[in-house]
Interface confidence: low
Amino acid sequence: YDFTNCDFEKIKAAYLSTISKDLITYMSGTKSTEFNNTVSCSNRPHCLTEIQSLTFNPTAGCASLAKEMFAMKTKAALAIWCPGYSETQINATQAMKKARKSKVTTNKCLEQVSQLQGLWRRFNRPLLKQQGSSDYKDDDDKHHHHHH
């Protein structure tokens, strides 16, 4: 899916109001220095591509995050604010349902969600490298203490 035509400000608002808090809840009890952020993204469409991949694609050691509250809200935000996104996810959703058994929070999942937090923070500051931080206040950093 090409995320170029998404309404990024609406997605950002959804993240700041709800998704960020659900990510924090998921990570509660984890030390902020426990995981290094190894996944990055260069612009908003790229960030959403990486966010979608980490949130919805099963990985070794973390079978499915897709039924976590932050994931459901991420999918809702993308489906509302990214034209045509829902249609592209139908087959992926079916595969996800078949794979879903029970929610188990593994260390690998915690690491993956830590990466997600970094991607979302980057999504909220897409021009940071080019323009410094004057145009993009770190609205979400008051909630997060992970280094990135």
């Epitope: 609406k10 109001s17 709800t18 999918k75 809702a76 509302i80 034209p83 959703t93 079916q94 349902k97």
Partner: antibody
Framework: EVQLVQSGAEVKKPGASVKVSCKAS????????MNWVRQAPGQRLEWMGI????????SYNQKFKGRVTLTVDKSASTAYMELSSLRSEDTAVYYC??????????????WGQGTTVTVSS | EIVLTQSPATLSLSPGERATLSCRAS?????MHWYQQKPGQAPRPLIY???NLASGIPARFSGSGSGTDYTLTISRLEPEDFAVYYC????????FGGGTKVEIK
């Protein structure tokens, strides 16, 4: 069992507003979207807009933008559709329709019974 | 806005016959949904995402298509199948087709 129960029929004068409610039960209200669709007599179905109950996010059909407002009361598991500046061509049956975004096709899988709104002077 | 054109507007057939309903989009869409509506009732989902049967829908209903052309087929019409059928897409806005009325010949 998923149920969407809508408020009763309304008769309004041109220029007035109408607010239709849709009470949801049988599922977690904040997990899914709510669409509003209308159907004028003998006409096709017409999508008006969608709301995400968990945070109130909305997307509207441009045709209705500025005249329609979608809201939810999470505590009451109820969605609302308010249409303002009514005109005679707004006479229609108005439906709420749940959309489960974790369901194949993302289509509208459960519908309310419909609310008839008549606009007449 | 993507416009959906359904044809024919009316299909007059007898029980036991095969019904083929067409839905054409003004530009390419990924999937098509189909609904059935009877007088005085809300629409009922039939087919999700082009070809997936909704819950409780008999196997005589099937859907196919891609791009701009989609088809709903009822292999053998039963008395309860006489109704209006709508296609629906979602690209950015949802839109519905104008409907095909399947009536008893």
């Amino acid at each position: 069992e998923v149920q969407l129960v809508q408020s009763g029929a309304e008769v309004k004068k041109p220029g007035a507003s109408v607010k239709v409610s849709c009470k949801a039960s049988g599922y977690t209200f904040t997990d899914d979207y709510m669409n509003w669709v209308r159907q004028a007599p003998g006409q096709r179905l017409e999508w008006m807009g969608i709301i995400s109950p968990y945070n109130g996010g909305t997307s509207y059909n441009q045709k209705f933008k500025g005249r329609v407002t979608l809201t939810v009361d999470k505590s009451a598991s109820t969605a609302y559709m308010e249409l303002s500046s009514l005109r005679s061509e707004d006479t229609a049956v108005y439906y709420c329709a749940r959309e489960d975004y974790d369901y194949d096709g993302y289509a509208m899988d459960h519908w309310g019974q419909g609310t008839t709104v008549t606009v007449s002077s | 806005e993507i416009v959906l054109t359904q044809s024919p507007a009316t299909l007059s057939l007898s029980p036991g016959e095969r019904a083929t309903l067409s839905c054409r989009a003004s530009s390419s869409v990924s999937y098509m949904h189909w609904y059935q509506q009877k007088p005085g009732q809300a629409p009922r989902p039939l087919i999700y995402a082009t070809s997936n049967l909704a819950s409780g829908i008999p196997a005589r209903f099937s859907g196919s298509g891609s791009g701009t052309d989609y088809t709903l087929t009822i292999s053998r019409l039963e008395p309860e199948d006489f109704a209006v059928y709508y296609c629906q897409q979602w690209s950015s806005n949802r839109t519905f087709g104008g409907g095909t009325k399947v009536e008893i010949k």
